[in-house]
């Protein structure tokens, strides 16, 4: 069964995949695809490398590690719920039926929006946005603003007052949830 990896909406997701090049610069073609690994290559290819470089990629998908040293881990930028599913990393080692293939399951959770410690009626404080940092591991999350005991009524009022704001739309569209306590 697939190894499972998790990320939140708005974060960068990280799917690890590695191999050891036979010699420095002696690279092996690798493909990443959305969906389990098929019989050959990758289905729905999102990124591909050849013996020298990344030769195909699509928006939001990139290799953050040093692929010339065999780190072909995939980063998916600013994930949405639609990015959930199985991904295939296929390392096309030369020879007769030598491919290494890995199915990785990505689970995307709605962003946790944590209410916070001061009474300012500021939407970004009551509904902190998640910031992501690019790095090798899963994206780190940071929250802006803060405030203590905010109750459901206050949240409801804030949301009503600012329901036309872009952030409110973002929260609705991404299925973000508000956690109390």
């Amino acid at each position: 069964s697939e190894v499972e990896y998790r990320a939140e909406v708005g974060q960068n997701a990280y799917l690890p995949c590695f191999y050891t090049p036979a010699a420095p610069g002696n690279l092996v073609p690798v493909c990443w695809g959305k969906g389990a690994c098929p019989v050959f290559e990758c289905g729905n290819v999102v990124l591909r490398t050849d013996e020298r470089d990344v030769n195909y990629w699509t928006s939001r998908y990139w290799l953050n590690g040093d692929f010339r040293k065999g780190d072909v881990s995939l980063t998916i930028e600013n994930v949405t719920l639609a990015d959930s599913g199985i991904y295939c990393c296929r390392i096309q080692i030369p020879g007769i039926m030598n491919d290494e293939k890995f199915n990785l399951k990505l689970v995307i959770k709605p962003a946790k929006v944590t209410p916070a410690p001061t009474r300012q009626r500021d939407f970004t404080a009551a509904f902190p946005r998640m910031l992501t940092t690019r790095g090798h591991g899963p994206a780190e999350t940071q929250t802006l603003g803060s405030l203590p005991d905010i109750n459901l009524t206050q949240i409801s009022t804030l949301a009503n007052e600012l329901r036309d704001s872009r952030l409110a739309n973002d929260l609705r569209d991404s299925g973000a949830t508000i956690r109390i306590g």
């Epitope: 073609p29 969906g35 389990a36 098929p38 019989v39 050959f40 290559e41 289905g43 729905n44 290819v45 050849d50 013996e51 199985i86 096309q92 080692i93 030369p94 020879g95 007769i96 039926m97 030598n98 491919d99």
Partner: antibody, heavy 117, light 107 residues
Framework: EVQLLESGGGLVQPGGSLRLSCAAS????????FSWVRQAPGKGLEWVSA????????YYADSVKGRFTISRDNSKNTLYLQMNSLRAEDTAVYYC??????????WGQGTLVTVSS | DIVMTQSPSSLSASVGDRVTITCQAS??????LNWYQQKPGKAPKLLIY???SLPIGVPSRFSGSGSGTDFTLTISSLQPEDFATYYC?????????FGQGTKLEIK
């Protein structure tokens, strides 16, 4: 025009050898995996062999492993199948087929290989 | 090897009929199921890939569905040029394998 054209089929005795060719045109040949698929007279389709775009990864059905060798020359846009130690059960029409997004989306017209004494 | 079983093996139908051919895999194939049409003396032609996707140029009367192990090819309204043999093929497990074929004949 996008097409594949096989050649090299014919009559050969059991134990003999034959080399099939498949000339591609109209697309970026080196970007695709290719396969050979065969069809015995009056029978269904059987996958035989496949090769990666750079030619360095190859794949074979158990029925032909050790006897057949798939290769390609990307500078000539040509795919090959070297068939050795041929048997009567290898008699079939051999098709080359381009593999794209998990399907064989482009096929040649086929070349008939007959193994008989 | 993954065994692909098609049914029926042969089928008689008339122009304008709706026809369904089924294909069952011996194990789950993650939707990696293709359908091909072959006419006598000709090479196969890809009709459906990835269970339900239509290649450019294939008429919309052809459709595919299914997941896991059970898949279906439907021709919504048979045309004279549709009488042929149809094969399913799985592209998940090694080696790729084909069904035994379904011969669609004129009634």
């Amino acid at each position: 025009e996008v097409q594949l054209l096989e050649s090299g089929g014919g009559l050969v005795q059991p134990g003999g050898s034959l080399r099939l060719s498949c000339a591609a045109s109209g697309f970026s040949f080196s970007s695709f995996y290719f396969s050979w698929v065969r069809q015995a007279p009056g029978k269904g389709l059987e996958w035989v062999s496949a090769i990666s775009g750079n030619g360095r990864s190859t794949y074979y059905a158990d029925s032909v492993k050790g006897r057949f060798t798939i290769s390609r020359d990307n500078s000539k846009n040509t795919l090959y199948l070297q068939m050795n130690s041929l048997r009567a059960e290898d008699t079939a029409v051999y098709y080359c087929a381009r593999y794209y997004n998990t399907g064989f989306d482009l096929w040649g017209q086929g070349t008939l290989v007959t193994v008989s004494s | 090897d993954i065994v692909m079983t098609q049914s029926p093996s042969s089928l008689s139908a008339s122009v304008g009929d709706r026809v369904t051919i089924t294909c069952q895999a011996s194990e789950a194939i993650y939707g990696y199921l293709n359908w091909y049409q072959q006419k006598p003396g000709k090479a196969p032609k890809l009709l459906i890939y990835a269970a339900s996707s239509l290649p450019i140029g294939v008429p919309s009367r052809f459709s595919g569905s299914g997941s896991g192990t059970d898949f279906t090819l439907t021709i919504s309204s048979l045309q004279p040029e549709d009488f042929a043999t149809y094969y399913c093929q799985q592209a998940y497990g090694f080696p790729p394998t084909f069904g035994q074929g379904t011969k669609l004949e004129i009634k």
